[in-house]
């Protein structure tokens, strides 16, 4: 056993090292450990086949270390892993496309926080058995077409707290059996119409904090089994290109967050669900510093570059933004409910999803909504105090959207076996 | 710096019910899932129940169902545990508590990072 | 529900020594398990939660590992203001359960 760690056998052959002050994977790693734990080191490297004597390893934590650097064949020969831990290495930003093949088993990777600038082609190939995938608060910018195509059984898509800026259509190609994916606190400002195409399983959908000032509902009309939609904190557009998404919502039986509208100003800070159709009228068109709301190619139908309902003659004159108004609708969040829709009472009772740091975030000032986030600025964050998890209404397979713990405190029966959060 | 501020001791009557109340600042109650913790003289450690965020409910361990409520009052950010029936073996140091994974939002660590200093009840007749 | 066990019960300890608490579960709560340090009159302390990650301000001294059902913290080179009792905490579903406590007394 290496001199700073402790090595033992019951329940499983362990090799624990942590917080040691490690700079290096130590040599001497008994060949038959089955879990590594080399967190909270001083690691920036791991050379190639650093554990490929270590054939029954199914758990390996190398989070919170100082990683600049992993070989492409670092993990060679672990045909057995199952958990792969590399968060918190904030140095590591890019990772070799190769590093991960033939990890056959893997079910859960965490990557969150390692300062990633992009994913590389073919860099989760092969991980058919992967069922949770840790990306967020990186530094991604783009999700490359058929990233995850490989990744039928994964059920859970962490991408929160990066700087995407767009959901192009073949992002989440593969992802049959997704049940949670979280895109919020990012930059996003378009998502292609068939972006969510596979996602039939989908529950839990997060796109609260991104520059939505608009979503095509074809993009929502796979999404057969959603149960928790979150679009609070985007610069939403309430005018006529709004009424498909109103109608959407309308009929959405599932939970979902407000939808507070930024533009056109006599709406600024209303819920979009608690609109009448007849209050989705005209258009409101940004212009002078902020960016079109709308970008779509000049047609017969379009010919402005506008949507129909936004041509000249659809338009009602009154509620066109004119050049250089603010498209500022200042704290347009804050209120749960919407003036005049207060519930009576003194507010104590059940909470419900508006409620939820979903649709205030906590900690932090909320900046005027604008249409646009200016570049360069992060989206509003939740304290980093550390990092959070259903079939089983196990906490920890957390998204437990469909299973209702309680009736009242019967705790759930889950088994936590497998990766969640 | 978020604090969990709680009511005075209380001396009650078997039989009767106390309500300890936990007032949150620095932020705001509706952005925090807050759960209770019970804890009696020499003895260790009780999770009684707390609002779970997931499935937006509030949970209860099985011991307690039907003699605690767990309630807020979100115009005064303030989280209220409510317990009847007492008998002299509640007599003891009551909790509330932050939990941690809540505002991670995603990454599910759940734990309970901030504590009230605690809230000491005592039944007796 | 869970049943969290922990070992010793009580351990007595010289100032710079390592000491070992452990804690197992009843079933696989993967590596959803927190560590909590509480001193006599005082709420408990967070020092550890997903099994190994550190919380913010706690010193490099403690360490968690573990995963499925056994999980360890670790004290490496003790100091006399870490005599307290500590109990880990499973927080894979409801009912959260702790486990029973561990005194730790300094020499």
């Known amino acids: 056993c290496p001199g700073a760690c402790v090595c033992y056998n019951e329940p499983k052959v362990t090799t624990s090292c942590p917080q040691q002050g490690l700079q290096a994977v130590p040599v001497g790693i008994p060949a038959a450990s089955q879990r590594i734990f080399l967190h909270g080191n001083r690691i920036s490297h791991v050379p190639a086949a650093s554990f490929r004597a270590c054939r029954n390893l199914t758990i390996l934590w190398l989070h919170s270390n100082v990683l600049a650097r992993i070989d492409a064949a670092a993990f060679t020969g672990l045909a057995l892993l199952e958990q792969l831990d590399l968060s918190d290495n904030a140095q590591l930003r890019s990772v070799d496309p190769a590093t991960f093949h033939g990890l056959g088993r893997l079910h859960t990777l965490h990557l969150d926080r390692c300062g990633l600038q992009e994913l590389g082609p073919g860099l989760f190939r092969g991980l058919a058995a992967l069922q949770y995938l840790y990306l967020q608060d990186n530094a991604l910018q783009a999700l490359p077409d058929d990233t995850f195509r490989d990744l039928g059984n994964l059920t859970h898509l962490f991408l929160h707290g990066n700087r995407i800026s767009s959901v192009p259509e073949r992002a989440f190609r593969g992802l049959h059996s997704l049940d949670r994916l979280l895109l919020h606190q990012n930059r996003v400002a378009h998502v292609h119409p068939h972006a969510f195409r596979d996602l039939g399983r989908l529950m839990t959908l997060y796109l609260f904090a991104n520059n939505l000032s608009a979503l095509p509902t074809e993009a929502l009309a796979p999404l057969r089994a959603l149960q928790y939609l979150r679009l609070n904190d985007n610069p939403w557009v309430c005018d006529c290109r709004a009424r498909p998404l109103w109608a959407w919502l309308q009929k959405f039986r599932g939970s979902s967050s407000e939808v507070p509208c930024s533009l056109p100003q006599r709406l600024a800070g209303r819920d979009l669900k608690r609109l009448a159709a007849n209050d989705l009228q005209g258009c409101a068109v940004a212009t002078g510093p902020y960016h079109p709301i709308w970008t779509g190619r000049a047609t017969d139908e379009e010919p402005l570059g506008l949507p129909k309902c936004c041509q000249p003659d659809a338009a009602d004159k009154a509620s066109v933004l004119e050049p250089g108004r603010p498209a500022s609708a200042g704290n347009a969040l804050k209120g749960r409910v919407p003036p005049g829709d207060s519930p009576p009472g003194n507010g104590s009772g059940p909470r419900h999803i508006n409620d939820s740091p979903f649709g205030t975030l906590p900690g932090s000032a909320e900046p005027p909504l604008t249409a646009v986030r200016p570049e360069g600025s992060e989206p509003p964050g939740f304290p980093t105090s550390g990092p959070r998890r259903r079939p089983g209404c196990s906490r920890k397979n957390r998204t437990r959207s469909h299973c209702r713990l309680g009736q009242a405190g019967s705790g759930g029966g889950g088994t936590g076996d497998s990766e969640g959060s | 710096q978020m604090q969990l501020v709680q009511s005075g001791a209380e001396v009650k009557k078997p039989g009767a019910s106390v309500k300890v109340s936990c007032k949150v600042s620095?932020?705001?109650?509706?952005?925090?899932?807050i759960h209770w913790v019970r804890q009696a003289p020499g003895k260790g450690l009780e999770w009684m129940g707390g609002f779970d965020p997931e499935d937006d409910e509030t949970v209860y361990a099985q011991k307690f169902q039907g003699r605690v409520t767990l309630t807020d009052d979100t115009s005064t950010d303030t989280a209220y545990m409510e317990l009847s029936s007492l008998r002299s073996e509640d007599t003891a140091v009551y909790y509330c508590?932050?939990?941690?994974?809540?505002?991670?939002?995603?990454?599910?660590?759940?734990?309970?990072?901030?504590w009230g200093r605690g809230t000491m009840i005592t039944v007796s007749s | 529900d869970i049943q969290m066990t922990q070992s010793p019960s009580s351990v007595s300890a010289s100032v710079g020594d390592r000491v070992t608490i452990t804690c197992r579960a009843s079933q696989d709560i993967n590596r959803w398990l927190a560590w909590y340090q509480q001193k006599p009159g005082k709420a408990p302390k967070l020092l550890i939660y997903?099994?190994?990650r550190l919380q913010s301000g706690v010193p490099l001294r403690f360490s968690g590992s573990g995963s499925g059902t056994d999980f360890t913290l670790t004290i490496n080179s003790l100091q006399p203001e870490d005599s307290a009792t500590y109990y880990c905490?499973?927080?894979?579903?409801?009912?959260?359960?702790f486990g029973q406590g561990t005194r730790l007394e300094i020499k």
């Open positions: 997903a099994a190994s």
């Open positions: 620095g932020y705001t109650l509706s952005e925090l899932s």
């Open positions: 508590a932050r939990d941690l994974g809540y505002l991670t939002s995603g990454n599910y660590y759940d734990a309970f990072d901030i």
């Open positions: 905490q499973q927080t894979n579903n409801f009912p959260r359960t």
